[in-house]
């Protein structure tokens, strides 16, 4: 049946899917607070532009009977059920905000004819790449693989003079939703990361990981994993590590490394942490006071999703263009809009661009220090610390294969 869009005559609505299965275990009231804060900003911006329109959100909740595991991996049908609910109510906004689970987003794309834009705080997996009406506001797996390949190949940094072409990947299946899809993209034989490496092996058992740390016959000195320092400690403990091992810990949505009083534990000295530049303006906002650093990024993505909706609404209304058209549905990409914490750039496929930051532990200060930045928009690595105080020999990253010598 035909669903009417509440999206004309000066009244514009965004439908927000409030799903039990979410990329981050975030109370739905926090998501609602983020959306409402975003709406307030959008109303102000539209008013300042002389656009006298009404903007609201309708929150669509799951009934919670079937899908209440809270685990993204059982989310496949929940999004479709919510869409059915919208369809039965014959009420749809101009834009759909959610879902955040990759399975759910993929299934919605597979099984529906989406003629309206969809904004997701998540949907990290490669299967959600290149979707014409999907916008993702948290770094998807594709962006991570581009960084890793760029970094592996780089051999002209003051602290990295070897190209790498090998890696171990630790993936035990208990990871968070973002980590699950990041590692999935590294594991996939068809992925860019796999394609560019001459050797890659996935370690699935704790013991496999622990054995590699001192194995003289290992095929690579580099291990990629995903999680926070505590996750690494549970796995590695205080075990000895060969001097030329480099662990890359992917922890994109964690601001704790930038806090003033943070000291890096000793077990982090062989580790490079890949995270993102911190946002700080959310710290003072009403809904974020009780959020962990990770959840802050999730809430911010929802808030920015509303601001993106407002930006597109303003652009189309100012140009006198219709909102309920395929042009509007396909317009949420290749643009920069004013986010809550500064400008936000979306690439040609509607995926957020960001600055990734590689940190190391200074052996002098025991603090996390920025080694380099990587701008996903231009695929460019920039060194920040020209003389890092590394644990590795000569304060340079080792070769990925022991005793191979300079190439």
């Amino acid at each position: 049946s035909q669903v009417s869009q509440n999206c004309h005559n000066g009244s514009y609505e965004i439908s927000v899917l409030m799903m039990d299965n979410s990329a981050f275990a975030e109370p739905l009231e926090n998501v609602e607070d983020a959306v409402n804060e975003g709406l307030e900003i959008v109303r102000g911006r539209l008013q300042n532009a002389g656009l006298n329109v009404t903007v609201n959100a309708s929150f669509m909740y799951s009934d919670g009977l079937i899908h209440n595991s809270g685990d993204c991996r059982s989310s496949t049908c929940e999004g479709l059920d919510l869409l059915r609910k919208i369809s039965n109510a014959k009420r749809m906004g101009c834009v759909l905000m959610g879902p955040s689970c990759t399975y759910s987003t993929f299934q919605m794309y597979l099984d529906t004819e989406l003629s309206y834009p969809m904004i997701s705080a998540g949907s990290f997996g490669l299967s959600c790449d290149y979707k014409e009406t999907l916008t993702r506001l948290m770094s998807p797996a594709r962006k991570l693989t581009y960084f890793l390949v760029n970094f592996w190949k780089t051999n002209d940094l003051p602290f990295k003079t070897y190209s790498w072409s090998t890696s171990y990947v630790y993936k035990n299946g208990t990871e968070s939703e973002d980590c699950f899809w990041y590692l999935n993209a590294l594991e996939a034989s068809v992925s860019y990361f796999s394609h560019e490496l001459s050797f890659k092996l996935v370690l699935r058992q704790d013991k496999e990981f622990q054995d590699i740390l001192m194995d003289h016959n290992r095929k690579s000195n580099v291990i990629v994993m995903c999680g926070d320092p505590q996750f690494l400690y549970k796995l590695k403990g205080d075990r000895a590590v060969a001097e030329d091992i480099v662990i890359i810990l992917v922890d994109l949505f964690n601001d704790q490394y930038f806090e003033d009083n943070v000291t890096a534990p000793d077990y982090m000295k062989n580790v490079l942490v890949l995270t993102q530049s911190p946002g700080n303006s959310l710290l003072n906002s009403s809904f974020s006071r009780n959020l962990s650093p990770t959840k802050r990024d999730f809430a911010l993505a929802y808030l920015n999703g509303i601001l993106l909706f407002g930006h597109m609404l303003k652009t189309f209304l100012e140009n006198g263009e219709n909102i309920t058209t395929p042009k509007f549905a396909h317009a949420f990409r290749n643009l920069t809009f004013e986010g809550y914490d500064g400008p936000v750039t979306l690439d040609d496929w509607g995926d957020v661009d960001s600055t990734m930051v590689l940190l190391y532990t200074s052996v002098d200060t025991k603090k996390y220090k920025v080694l380099l930045t990587y701008d996903t928009h231009v695929n460019q690595t920039n060194p920040v610390d020209m003389s890092p105080t590394f644990t590795w020999k000569n304060s340079k990253l080792p070769n990925d294969i022991t005793d191979r010598g300079p190439q």
Partner: antibody, heavy 118, light 110 residues
């Protein structure tokens, strides 16, 4: 195409401070660094310091350490350079420039002439 | 950190080639492949001509080239033209993650 816009001129008294702004128009400060470089009349270029706005990381030339503060406001894509305890020899044109790569300043502001005079 | 050493002036006739040197230490020029060269006309902002020792930004004539040997970097301008008359500065990073400029060279086209 990013342009860096600076105010034209400032006149200051010895001992006071000056805060020069540098706004990125037609783009954002992004992950690039913004350097501040000064040039006294008839003299060469002198690097003062830089900031990576997205991280708030700063580096200062030893000569200016303790007297210069570089900040940035991501939301307005504006960088600032504040120089305190001004003396007559600080009279110079102060440029901001975008570091696209280390020590590669590819976009420059038009410069702000700061005159320190009693 | 005092400036990198450049000759105060160089000159050449139209069509000739000239080279400007930039000498530092192993903690700056010698230690990193991040040497840049700038051209500055009177009353104007500097313009990036060479970055990372030998790379030219788009729009810069291929008459400009850069190189480095040990602690000394060089800028070569071939087929000298009247509009090349300007001040030229080198710059590089240091082991302190700061930058330093050269003392500057005035190029005169005779």
């Amino acid at each position: 195409e990013v342009q860096l816009v600076q105010p034209g001129a400032e006149v200051k008294k010895p001992g006071s401070s000056v805060k020069v702004s540098c706004k990125a128009s037609g783009g954002t400060l992004s992950s690039y660094a913004i350097s501040w470089v000064r040039q006294a009349p008839g003299q060469g270029l002198e690097w003062m310091g830089r900031i990576i706005p997205i991280l708030g990381i700063t580096n200062y030339a030893q000569k200016f350490q303790g007297r210069v503060t570089i900040t940035a406001d991501k939301s307005t894509s504006t960088a600032y350079m504040e120089l305190s305890s001004l003396r007559s020899e600080d009279t110079a044109v102060y440029f901001c420039a975008r570091d696209q790569r280390p020590a590669s300043m590819d976009v420059w502001g038009q410069g702000t002439l700061v005159t320190v005079s009693s | 950190q005092s400036g990198l050493t450049q000759p105060a002036s160089v000159s050449g006739s139209p069509g000739q080639s000239i080279t400007i040197s930039c000498t530092g230490t192993s903690s700056d020029v010698g230690g990193y492949n991040y040497v840049s060269w700038y051209q500055q006309h009177p009353g104007k902002a500097p313009k990036l001509m060479i970055y990372e020792v030998s790379n030219r930004p788009s729009g810069v004539s291929n008459r400009f080239s850069g190189s480095k040997s040990g602690n000394t970097a060089s800028l070569t301008i071939s087929g000298l033209q009247a509009e090349d008359e300007a001040d030229y500065y080198c710059s590089t990073v240091t082991s302190l993650s700061t930058y330093v400029f050269g003392t500057g060279t005035k190029l005169t086209v005779l």
